[in-house]
Amino acid sequence: MAVTACQGLGFVVSLIGIAGIIAATCMDQWSTQDLYNNPVTAVFNYQGLWRSCVRESSGFTECRGYFTLLGLPAMLQAVRALMIVGIVLGAIGLLVSIFALKCIRIGSMEDSAKANMTLTSGIMFIVSGLCAIAGVSVFANMLVTNFWMSTANMYTGMGGMVQTVQTRYTFGAALFVGWVAGGLTLIGGVMMCIACRGLAPEETNYKAVSYHASGHSVAYKPGGFKASTGFGSNTKNKKIYDGGARTEDEVQSYPSKHDYV
């Protein structure tokens, strides 16, 4: 019962997480204009992974897609890639986990197969969550770098032609949605992996096996010893899992570069 609950909860948490990752990826507010000196603005800029928008005080909003692919910063491309990989892995994980759910009966699928599928989906969710967290973190790092760069060059001219106040951008809502969603997907994945251990059929090995020694007839019951030490042929049916431990290095952010009213 606890295993089913853990698996079900892991699925639901991952589902919410992946929905959040998709939402974050589609959102326009990855970076929003920093209102450092003017909290009420007549023109407000914000940017997403796919387009940039300008909202006027009049209420009109104009969004323009990034129609170039080669002209975009490499870091933005990397963030896009990480988020898409996260979504794809998460979607596959969801598909796999649906069939792995203990409460769903599909033909004569054995528990061992369900356990394998649960583990697979769990790992997929973990990697999906890490991709999302990494993507959002890279973008955030990019913003921080640019924020201080634009602060240093606050009143630089554009090629000496036009004196323009450089727009500074700060964290948008999508970053927080992405971090939370990535975290939820990660937690859901860990829960699936934990559930997998409970789903795995553990051989009891308490059937008496007769070994005929020369001149003697002695019955041994070796299951407990073999199960605990890992010796013997029965170990192939024993699921050994490390709990999906991962190092913090997989979520490191990288130095980057990126760009109110």
Epitope: Q33, A42, V43, N45, V54, G59, Q163, V165
Partner: antibody
């Protein structure tokens, strides 16, 4: 067609308050911000503030803040500007104007003359 | 606050001639998000409310004659009336629509020589 009809002229004593109305018609009232502009006799234009009829959010010129209050009545598509603690320099024509693309004012009311005199 | 400075204060031009009004802002009105200049031009005739001519520095409002054109970017802007007509006698104002408080220039009075 878009129309902004303002209330009639007002004569007030110093220290009093005045409430000018601006009734909008011919467009979706909540879809456009409404602004108020002051024009003193023989002078230029001065922005007072604006109100978002959808959310009710307001922005004011610091010069008028504390003395001016912008309100709306969605049921009658009317915007109100109340100016308190009137002084002689408040004598002017007050216009309401609809905000358009580029934050420009595309339609204006006919203006309301407010005279402050003792 | 952004200060808008118009020049000249008044302008006398012969009918059919070109009239040029300048407007300078104390800060750039160019928005980096959409590369548009948030500057508007209005025409005001005596006893009437102002009338919108040009927004985004160079976009003519529908119905405005094409003899009116706006140009400039950043801090320096120009309103040009290519061939002055009698009905163009008015006061012309530029406005900062980029940053609150929204501010107007002092106005330029256009007359017929």
């Amino acid at each position: 067609q878009v129309q902004l009809v303002q209330s009639g002229a007002e004569v007030k004593k110093p220290g009093a308050s005045v409430k000018v109305s601006c009734k909008a018609s011919g467009y979706s009232f909540t879809g456009y911000n409404m602004n108020w502009v002051k024009q003193a006799p023989g002078q230029g234009l001065e922005w007072i503030g604006n109100i978002d009829p959808y959310y009710g959010g307001t922005s004011y010129n610091q010069k008028f803040k504390g003395r001016v209050t912008l309100t709306i009545d969605k049921s009658t598509s009317t915007v109100y500007m109340e100016l308190s603690s009137l002084r002689s320099e408040d004598t002017a024509v007050y216009y309401c104007a609809r905000m358009y693309h580029g934050n420009a004012f595309d339609y204006w009311g006919q203006g309301t003359t407010v005279t402050v005199s003792s | 606050d952004i200060v808008m400075t118009q020049s000249p204060d008044s302008l006398a031009v012969s009918l059919g001639e070109r009239a040029t009004i300048n407007c300078k802002s104390s800060q750039s009105l160019l928005n980096s998000g959409n590369l548009k200049n948030y500057l508007t031009w209005y025409q005001q005739k005596p006893g009437q409310p102002p009338k919108l001519l040009i927004y985004w520095a160079s976009t003519r409002k529908s119905g405005v004659p094409d003899r009116f054109s706006g140009s400039g970017s950043g801090t320096d802007f120009t309103l040009t009336i290519s061939s002055l007509q009698a009905e163009d006698v008015a006061v012309y104002y530029c406005q900062n629509d980029y940053s609150y408080p929204l501010t107007f220039g002092g106005g330029t009075k256009v007359e017929i020589k």
